[in-house]
């Protein structure tokens, strides 16, 4: 997997006007990395992962860039003519990413009322629209005022793709973020279904990379995808994820039953406890 | 002593049906996971099917898909395989196989095996 | 589907030598293959379950090694009664699939 750092920008319009708060996510490796608050802009890192790559220092320019990236997205919504009542929102999301073999890829997408209108390749420069005449018309739009504000200001659009990987490689340089394994701890546990079955629940934590193999198995053998029920695989919050599979199974038969897990090459198996113990579904002791 | 006894072998032409059938005893049917294996002429052994407890997984070889069908009756310990759509390729000696208690995925006991033969 | 190829196809060998066979396996199947033997004209029988385990009244001459994509069979003193062929199965995928088989025949 590649090494990845994504900007999400927010601005808001309310009845043609623009507001000015916005909202700036930043991820690191598809982690929750930075964040800038609506009014006030001050680089937030995301746990203390987010710290750790940082180190121990002011999030000035991190606020400054974002504050200048914030800045320029207003300006542009502000050019999107015919913008009807109520809220509208442009959305502007920037990734670049470095590969194992030094490659590089940078885009940049743009997003009006959570709908793709605009993308560019920042390393090509080139664009490319949906086929939606609306879609069309705002790309025309943004498009233009792009290319006169790239003539009058250095700020946003300037040499995107290279600023993006500047900041990725600066990040990568901390340590914290090289290419690393955090084996996850499984939990299983079991709680009353119905009369004779019981719902087992297999939690996968603190792992990372994301890709992670969890899956229900009666005498080894996998259970069908219907009769499993799996959780997305989230950021925890700590620069790990977390996710869940659970299974219904006749009471009785636990033992048949195990949790497999299998993540960056290591592979584990996982019965359901014994049923001396049980989490009950209800509010009593 | 755990017996698998398959039935229903036979000659067919192709295109034709047949149905086979596994009647166990030994052992507690229902709570067994069962499969078909399948073993032509002077050839290995080739997977079918498999059927867990409660019929709740069902799995097949793509090379039957859609034209076999596996399902069990643990009220009558039998496990069975209706083939439909013959063809010469599926001439072979059919093995009901059940699945070991907390294996991996093994195949613990099998039938003597009933022979199909598909010809016109 | 997870193919698995055996190697060798067949080996001539005499009572009491140590014979090995391989199992590839074309993808990672961790630890979830299965050793058969078959006898003509008899139905398989299970000698080693998830790589390395012993089924229960085989004999110990017989052992099973390796995970992820390389298996090994190994009789570590042939008796006459081990005259067969040898298949490794794997259960990793729900497309369970046997390999071609060894054969062991007297030298």
């Known amino acids: 997997e590649p090494h990845s750092l994504r900007y999400n920008l927010t601005v808001l319009s309310w009845d043609g006007s623009v507001q000015s708060g916005f909202l700036t996510e930043v991820h690191l490796d598809g982690q929750p990395f930075l964040r800038c608050d609506r009014q006030k802009c001050r680089a937030k890192p995301q746990g203390q992962w987010a710290e750790d790559v940082l180190g121990n220092k002011t999030w000035d320019r991190e606020t400054r860039d974002l504050t200048g990236n914030g800045k320029d997205l207003r300006m542009t919504l502000a050019h999107i003519k015919d913008q009807k009542e109520g809220l509208h929102s442009l959305q502007e999301i920037r990734v670049c990413e470095i590969h194992e073999d030094n490659s590089t890829r940078s885009s940049q997408h743009f997003y009006y009322d959570g709908e793709l209108f605009l993308s560019q390749n920042l390393e090509t420069k080139e664009w490319t629209m949906p086929q939606s005449s609306r879609a069309q018309t705002l790309a025309m739009n943004v498009r233009n005022f792009l290319k006169e504000d790239a003539m009058k200001t250095k700020t946003h659009y300037h040499a995107m793709h290279a600023d993006c990987l500047q900041e990725l490689r600066r990040y990568l340089k901390s340590g914290v973020v090289l290419r690393r394994t955090v084996p996850p701890m499984v939990n299983v546990t079991r709680s009353e279904a119905s009369e004779g079955n019981i719902t087992v629940t297999c939690r996968a934590s603190g792992f990372y990379p994301w890709n992670i193999t969890l899956s229900w198995r009666q005498d080894g053998v996998s259970l069908s995808h219907d009769t499993q029920q799996w959780g997305d695989v989230l950021p925890d919050g700590n620069g790990t994820y977390q996710t869940w599979v659970a299974t219904r199974i006749c009471q009785g038969e636990e033992q048949r039953f195990t949790c497999y897990m299998e993540h960056s090459g290591n592979h584990s198996t996982h019965p359901v406890p014994s049923g001396k113990v049980l989490v009950l579904q209800s509010h009593w002791q | 002593e755990v017996q698998l006894v398959e039935s229903g072998g036979g000659l067919v032409q192709p295109g034709g049906s047949l149905r086979l059938s596994c009647a166990a005893s030994?052992?507690?049917?229902?709570?067994?996971?069962m499969n078909w294996v399948r073993q032509a002429p002077g050839k290995g052994l080739e997977w079918v099917s498999y059927?867990?407890?409660?019929?709740?997984?069902?799995y097949y070889a793509d090379s039957v898909k859609g034209r076999f069908t596996i399902s069990r009756d643990d009220a009558r310990k039998s496990l069975y395989l209706q083939m439909n759509s013959l063809r010469d390729e599926d001439t072979a000696v059919y093995y009901c196989?059940?699945?070991?208690?907390?294996?991996?995925?093994?195949?613990?006991?099998w039938g003597q095996g009933t022979l199909v033969t598909v010809s016109s | 589907d997870i193919q698995m190829t055996q190697s060798p196809s067949s080996l001539s060998a005499s009572v009491g030598d140590r014979v090995t066979i391989t199992c590839r396996a074309s993808?990672?199947?961790?630890?979830?293959l299965n050793w058969y033997q078959q006898k003509p004209g008899k139905d398989p029988k299970v000698l080693i379950f998830?790589?390395?385990s012993l089924q229960s009244g085989v004999p110990s001459r017989f052992s099973g090694s390796g995970s992820g994509t390389d298996f090994t069979l190994t009789i570590s003193s042939l008796q006459p009664e081990d005259f067969a062929t040898y298949y490794c199965q794997q259960s990793y995928s729900t497309r369970f699939t046997f390999g071609p088989g060894t054969k062991v025949d007297i030298k």
């Open positions: 196989a059940r699945v070991m208690v907390r294996g991996s995925g093994t195949f613990d006991y």
């Open positions: 998830a790589a390395s």
């Open positions: 059927i867990s407890t409660r019929s709740s997984t069902i």
């Open positions: 993808q990672s199947i961790t630890y979830f």
């Open positions: 030994g052992f507690t049917f229902s709570t067994y996971s």
